[in-house]
């Protein structure tokens, strides 16, 4: 029987990707393992090779089709198995019945750009990537701004409780370099989590006009 504690966690990006992490205490680092996806109501199945990401955890991405294709729906259940090679046979190490729309993690927002910048404010827009049309407007965002001399962890979180792909940052300091990030989360799904943070967007506020009060 399998020994040690295991964890097998997967998320669906809402379109054509299931990303999985498997961790197993005491597992051999050089063992060949894979994740196998077996849908309950579709003709395809898919496999990905688990690659080490740390001493006792492995990760892989199940690519189900073209990035923007809708490969699964809210009624699908996909049985996911971790299989590891043991001599000449494959051994099942972990198994779960995966409900894709209960375990969502979208791709990080993309195409961040400064729409307009002034001395004290900056308007920024972004786009969501590979997000299902099923969500319609049922998404929320978190944003954060990195100020000089601070860390991302210290940055206060700004919450946008609707599908709003822009923000107007205010009370900024003139002639100052900032960075901005945003992430997205569907409202649907018991185990749904935030997307990764977007790539940071660097911008600089305009200098204050000479002789004017700031």
């Amino acid at each position: 029987a399998v020994n040690g504690t295991s964890q097998f966690t997967c998320f669906y990006n809402s379109r054509a990707n299931i990303s999985c992490v498997w961790s197993q205490d005491g597992a051999l680092q050089d063992t060949s393992c894979q994740v196998h996806a077996w849908p309950d109501r579709r003709r395809w199945n898919q496999t990905c090779e688990l690659l080490p990401v740390s001493q006792a955890s492995w990760a892989c991405n199940l690519i189900l089709g073209a990035p923007d294709s809708q490969k699964l729906t809210t009624v699908d259940i996909v049985t996911l198995r971790v299989l590891c090679r043991e001599g000449v046979r494959w051994r099942v190490m972990a198994i779960q019945d995966f409900k894709p729309f209960e375990n969502l993690r979208l791709m990080a927002p993309i195409s961040l750009q400064v729409v307009h910048v002034e001395t004290h404010r900056c308007n920024i827009s972004w786009e969501i990537s590979q997000a299902s049309h099923y969500f319609e407007r049922h998404l929320e965002f978190e944003a954060r701004t990195l100020s000089p001399g601070h860390t991302w962890e210290e940055a206060p979180l700004l919450t946008l409780k609707q599908k709003q792909e822009w923000i107007c940052l205010e009370t900024l300091t003139p002639d100052t370099q900032y960075e901005f990030q945003v992430r997205v989360k569907p409202l649907q799904g018991e185990f749904t989590t935030w997307s990764p943070w977007s790539q940071p967007l660097a911008f600089r506020t305009k200098p204050a006009a000479l002789g004017k009060d700031t």
Epitope: A1, V2, T5, S6, Q7, F8, Q24, W38, D40, I77, T79, R81, V82, R91, V92, M93, A94, I95, Q96, D97
Partner: nanobody, 125 residues
Framework: EVQLVESGGGLVQPGGSLRLSCAIS????????IGWVRQAPGKQREGVSC????????FYADSVKGRFTISKDNAKSTVYLQMTNLKPDDTAVYYC??????????????????WGLGTQVTVSS
């Protein structure tokens, strides 16, 4: 080799209750994901309930949620399926099954490594 022996089946009226037992020998209960799978005449095997190895998470088919409860007694190496408010649709042979892995599956019963011989449950007036 793990052996599974079911008991507790029988004839019961609609709305009645039964408790199925599955005694496990040849292995420790904590080492396996355990499932109850049923097969009605002329139908495919259907996962009813299962319990994940090590973290004891429990899962139920929508058709039995709120009526059936899976539990285990490590000291007795036995898994139970408490069935209440039974319906004629619950009539089937009930099998206990085990998988040598973390987790369990209701959707794909063929993933189980070890099977009992089954116990008949008949719900009829």
């Amino acid at each position: 080799e793990v052996q599974l022996v079911e008991s507790g089946g029988g004839l019961v009226q609609p709305g009645g209750s039964l408790r199925l037992s599955c005694a496990i020998s040849g292995g420790t209960l904590d080492s396996y994901g355990i499932g109850w799978v049923r097969q009605a005449p002329g139908k495919q095997r259907e996962g009813v309930s299962c319990m994940s190895r090590s973290d004891d998470r429990t899962f139920y088919a929508d058709s039995v949620k709120g009526r059936f409860t899976i539990s285990k007694d490590n000291a007795k190496s036995t898994v139970y399926l408490q069935m209440t408010n039974l319906k004629p649709d619950d009539t089937a042979v009930y099998y206990c099954a085990a998988v040598d892995a973390y987790g369990c599956s209701l959707v794909q019963p063929t993933t189980y490594d070890f099977w009992g011989l089954g116990t008949q449950v008949t719900v009829s007036s």
